[in-house]
Amino acid sequence: APVRSLNCTLRDSQQKSLVMSGPYELKALHLQGQDMEQQVVFSMSFVQGEESNDKIPVALGLKEKNLYLSCVLKDDKPTLQLESVDPKNYPKKKMEKRFVFNKIEINNKLEFESAQFPNWYISTSQAENMPVFLGGTKGGQDITDFTMQFVSS
């Protein structure tokens, strides 16, 4: 069977939503009412990888776009980017490791750890309107905890 993909939105633990900021960047900010329609809808694919009760490997694409969150080294630092792919070949069960995140849920907290760079997480800043990035610290100033709202296709 082909890879299963479900639509969802994410909010960080401060209730900031994720929106597009230019063609290849996401930012986090508080949205209300009609503005909630601006939030990015992800197509989350359940991909191949090491799995446990608390950890599920996923890829995060942007709904109806050939863009996926990926983790690469830039200037020797693990970096989050939006990468364009060939829609004829994606999503797939065996995604390249840079596209894979371990969705980890423990005690009402949801984290997305890079499979390529263990202990690096999708992160947001405390400040409003700042880019979503890959962070190497948990429990500090930056936010690594999210909630997820699945939405109908």
């Epitope: 069977a1 639509n7 969802c8 608390d54 849920e105 907290k109 949801l110 997820m148």
Partner: antibody
Amino acid sequence: EVQLVESGGGVVQPGRSLRLSCSSSGFIFSRYDMSWVRQAPGKGLEWVAYISHGGAGTYYPDSVKGRFTISRDNSKNTLFLQMDSLRVEDTAVYYCARGGVYKGYFDVWGQGTPVTVSS
Amino acid sequence: DIQMTQSPSSLSASVGDRVTITCRASGNIYTYLNWYQQTPGKAPKLLIYNAKELAEGVPSRFSGSGSGTDYTFTISSLQPEDIATYYCQHFWRLPYTFGQGTKLQIT
């Protein structure tokens, strides 16, 4: 023995609220995604709410979105469904079920609690 | 939403008969399909998941098959306790939806 027991159903007027509970036993509740599935009188089954094992993920179909809220208390092995702005068409038996989005199936069910919305 | 259509809506059969129920999806669901049994006045019970895998404790007379949009549920030798309504349910895309049910009676 693995068991789910629902409570909180009853008769309520349109526009009012009701809160259902589901108590679990016989398995480690905090490790399982949970759902509510309803069955209108003489009708089929409809999945109406989902919550992930830790509570960080939720899902509602369009028919109840914005009116129903699912939550859980893992320390008390209990699942909840807060139903607001109830409509006549919400009349159904409400089942608590183990499972949801990821595995896709519901492998343990409660006996159900009836909810009647009528003026 | 993907619609699930079961046929027949009801059927009668004798003890020992082979019984087949079909479920058709409005789009390809790639074997992401489950089957449930609901006996009168009781909660549903999972019988088959992933189109063909038997759930724990379910007798081997129950089986499932199919791919694409068309799926089949079979009872190889009908027993009196199999009197129930049977439902299919897909889990390919949200929302996951159930078929309308097939009511099985014994003649």
